[in-house]
Amino acid sequence: EPHSLRYNLTVLSGDGSVQSGFLAEVHLDGQPFLRCDRQKCRAKPQGQWAEDVLGNKTWDRETRDLTGNGKDLRMTLAHIKDQKEGLHSLQEIRVCEIHEDNSTRSSQHFYYDGELFLSQNLETEEWTMPQSSRAQTLAMNVRNFLKEDAMKTKTHYHAMHADCLQELRRYLKSGVVLRRTVPPMVNVTRSEASEGNITVTCRASGFYPWNITLSWRQDGVSLSHDTQQWGDVLPDGNGTYQTWVATRICQGEEQRFTCYMEHSGNHSTHPVPSGKVLVLQSHWQHHHHHHGLNDIFEAQKIEWHE
């Protein structure tokens, strides 16, 4: 995977007027890295790993850049003519990447009320917009505004591209960081499912990167997919990830089952704890609970385009 730096800024308007303040998130190699919100923008490292990367650096430069970007985005939202009553959002996502062969990519995307309406390749300065007429009108309007503003302020898009890459390289230089691997903690629990059956759940948490194999084995052989239920791999808020897999087994056969985990070239097997049932709750309820969580994250993906 390429190294990447992604800026995600959102501004809001209510009943025709643009609200002060904005929300900004910066992701480094897909991990939450910096965050800025409300009236006061103070760029803060997200989680211990980000602090480890940048140490006790002052955040003035990040704060200044994000505040400037937020101000520009508020001006763009103020310019949009078709604002109706109610709450509206304008979101800008800017991404730059450095690939293994040292080639680079940069792009910028604009979303209005969660819908993509304008994209630009920052290297070629080529714009793309969707087919729908409403989005196209909005896109033309914003594109022209941005072009005029760029001429006034002598800002060129390739400069955005260069700045983003410069910043990314600076971050990469500053740490052993981003190709780091954090092994998961694996925990196996059991819960009563129905007469004579138990549900066993294997949870892996605190791992990075997100790619992981987690599955149940019976006598060392993988169970078929239709007998296992997996949770999504979700961020746990600490710059690491978590996931789970569950299956239903006959009580008394616990010794035949192990949870197999493989992550970043390392693997481990984890037996089912014997003895009393630890969690007196149907795990299939757990699953609905987890799907609820997943739905929240899916909703966040729609809103934040992550």
């Epitope: 052989v221 010794q255 035949r256 693997h267 037996p271």
Partner: antibody
């Protein structure tokens, strides 16, 4: 490629014990179970037990409990089966096998002939 | 213990002939847990078919497997001289794992 190389034939006296080894190569040893199977002369196959090399956990055929002890040495990627209090009934070829994760006995060792005779 | 009964015990077939070996289980087992092995004289057993109908790596397509519940079978579409061996079914559904008593296949 996956290979299981077993120790050579053993001629032992009744009442003695023997340790059969199975050296694995061509894959990550702790990733897959090692299974042990007995084949008496001209007879069918009998499953003895298996061991998870990662954590040393074993599951055994009740018939062989007290007869066979399964262990591993992770540093040398070798599994061992210790057979004790040997009688003529224990004369057989003993196989180790491992899995690819999809079927039980995917790969087999060449077998170790144990002969119990006075 | 689950007992697997194979039939026939021995059989002789001509090259090109179709062969079917059956394996009957004393209690029902899921098709995911039934496997077939081939053992040629003087050699270790070799996985032939796993999970009832999946051919193991390198096994010729003339071999096939089917069945469910208590009744399973192994078929050789056209017998070849190199297929002379003893064939075993094996269940992994319950502990202890058990094997069939074997079917010895000879050539006419």
């Amino acid at each position: 490629q996956v290979q299981l190389k077993q120790s050579g034939p053993e001629l032992v006296k009744p009442g003695a014990s023997v340790k059969v080894s199975c050296k694995a190569s061509g894959y990550a040893f702790t990733k897959y179970n090692i299974y042990w199977v007995k084949q008496s002369h001209g007879k069918s196959l009998e499953w003895i037990g298996y061991i998870d090399p990662y954590n040393g956990g074993t599951v055994q055929n009740q018939k062989f409990k007290g007869k066979a002890t399964l262990t591993v040495d992770k540093s040398s990627s070798t599994a061992y089966m210790h057979l004790n209090s040997l009688t003529s009934e224990d004369s057989a070829v003993y196989y180790c096998a491992t899995t690819d994760g999809y079927s039980l006995f995917t790969y087999w060792g060449q077998g170790t002939l144990v002969t119990v005779s006075s | 213990d689950i007992v697997l009964t194979q039939s026939p015990t021995t059989m002789a077939a001509s090259p090109g002939e179709k062969i079917t070996i059956t394996c009957s289980a004393s209690s029902s087992i899921s098709s995911n847990y039934l496997h077939w092995y081939q053992q040629k004289p003087g050699f270790s057993p070799k996985l032939l078919i796993y999970r009832t109908s999946n051919l193991a790596s390198g096994v010729p397509a003339r071999f096939s497997g089917s069945g469910s519940g208590t009744s399973y079978s192994l078929t050789i579409g056209t017998m070849e001289a190199e297929d002379v061996a003893t064939y075993y079914c094996q269940q992994g559904s319950s502990i202890p794992f058990t094997f069939g008593s074997g079917t010895k296949l000879e050539i006419k």
